[in-house]
């Protein structure tokens, strides 16, 4: 009955503060409408990073001001989070909701630990 969600345990953000990972869910039924939410957990506090609802076969659309982008392929969602800094290092949880058709299913991943290292400032050249 429970929906399994898989995501990588660890991801290292690029020097430009971009981190990408795949969120894959084992759909118990044939969902046509799916909601994907990225949550950040820090000190047992959970906050929403971004969210998108999409129809199967269509593109994933986040809000214009979102720091996330993504693409979907079947039961797999490729997520990219941009603008990350060292202080954003933490556990990022992929949450999947099968909104339609019934029944509703909720799937929570174990989380991806994203490490972000701020780039060293370039030394002044003489």
């Amino acid at each position: 009955k429970a929906m399994h969600v898989a995501q990588p345990a660890v991801v290292l953000a690029s020097s430009r503060g971009i981190a990408s990972f795949v969120c894959e869910y084992a759909s118990p039924g044939k969902a046509t409408e799916v909601r994907v939410t990225v949550l950040r957990q820090a000190d047992s506090q959970v906050t929403e990073v971004c969210a998108a609802t999409y129809m199967m076969g269509n593109e994933l659309t986040f809000l214009d001001d979102s720091i996330c982008t993504g693409t979907s392929s079947g039961n797999q969602v490729n997520l990219t989070i941009q603008g990350l800094r060292a202080m954003d290092t933490g556990l990022y949880i992929c949450k999947v909701e099968l909104m339609y058709p019934p029944p509703y299913y909720l799937g929570i991943g174990n989380g991806t630990q994203i490490y972000v290292i701020d780039p060293e400032p370039c030394p002044d050249s003489d």
Epitope: K1, A2, M3, R35, V46, K95, M99, Y104, L106, I108
Partner: antibody, heavy 118, light 108 residues
Framework: QVQLVESGGGVVQPGRSLRLSCAAS????????MHWVRQAPGKGLEWVTF????????YYADSVKGRFTISRDNSKNTLYLQMNSLRAEDTAIYYC???????????WGQGTLVTVSS | EIVLTQSPGTLSLSPGERATLSCRAS???????LAWYQQKPGQAPRLLIY???SRATGIPDRFSGSGSGTDFTLTISRLEPEDFAVYYC?????????FGQGTKVEIK
């Protein structure tokens, strides 16, 4: 702080209608799915209905399907429950509840009592 | 529909004692989708445990949850006077959302 305040309960005759409201404050209402849960006098908790973020998707318990309608107005931060064709067995305290980020019902209103009696 | 059965129906204990409440599901529930609530007379339910073993904000550490699959347990290590109440388990992994019938923890 998060607050959910129900209103609209009262005494109503069988077969009549009633509309409950739940005013939400202290959080971004449109970012959360919501539920109504009821509790008959001296009994346990019974889930009644669910509504998605934008109100597009709704789910109902078999006991109320076709009689109750859940809706929301995100511009007013308010959740509603329209109850038609009320029966004596619908007598209960009705609670609105917020779905937490990880799925459980993390905040509940204080409840509003609905009594269906002739 | 996932049916949750709680036992015992009533637990009579004294303050300071350990309380062990059981919740059994009719089919497997992922541990991420099992919650426990506390309800006192005249009050709304309060979330205690989610994800089978994570304590909600502000819940004292004498409350702990465990279990997986179909068998889950809520343990109160040392009962305080304010812990005497009714406790409900709930699954939230799929619709319809379901609750157990409750366990009343009363003063012996």
């Amino acid at each position: 702080q998060v607050q959910l305040v129900e209103s609209g309960g009262g005494v109503v005759q069988p077969g009549r209608s009633l509309r409950l409201s739940c005013a939400a404050s202290g959080f971004t209402f449109s970012h959360y799915t919501m539920h109504w849960v009821r509790q008959a006098p001296g009994k346990g908790l019974e889930w009644v209905t669910f509504i998605s973020y934008d109100g597009h998707n709704k789910y109902y318990a078999d006991s109320v399907k076709g009689r109750f309608t859940i809706s929301r107005d995100n511009s007013k931060n308010t959740l509603y429950l329209q109850m038609n064709s009320l029966r004596a067995e619908d007598t209960a305290i009705y609670y609105c509840a917020r779905t937490g980020w990880l799925g459980p019902f993390d905040y509940w209103g204080q409840g509003t009592l609905v009594t269906v009696s002739s | 529909e996932i049916v949750l059965t709680q036992s015992p129906g009533t637990l009579s204990l004294s303050p300071g004692e350990r309380a062990t409440l059981s919740c059994r599901a009719s089919q497997s529930v992922g541990s991420s989708y099992l919650a426990w609530y506390q309800q006192k007379p005249g009050q709304a339910p309060r979330l205690l445990i989610y994800g089978a073993f994570s304590r909600a904000t502000g819940i004292p550490d004498r409350f702990s949850g465990s279990g997986s699959g179909t068998d889950f347990t809520l343990t109160i290590s040392r009962l305080e006077p304010e812990d005497f109440a009714v406790y409900y388990c709930q699954q939230y992994g799929s619709s319809p959302w379901t609750f157990g019938q409750g366990t009343k923890v009363e003063i012996k």
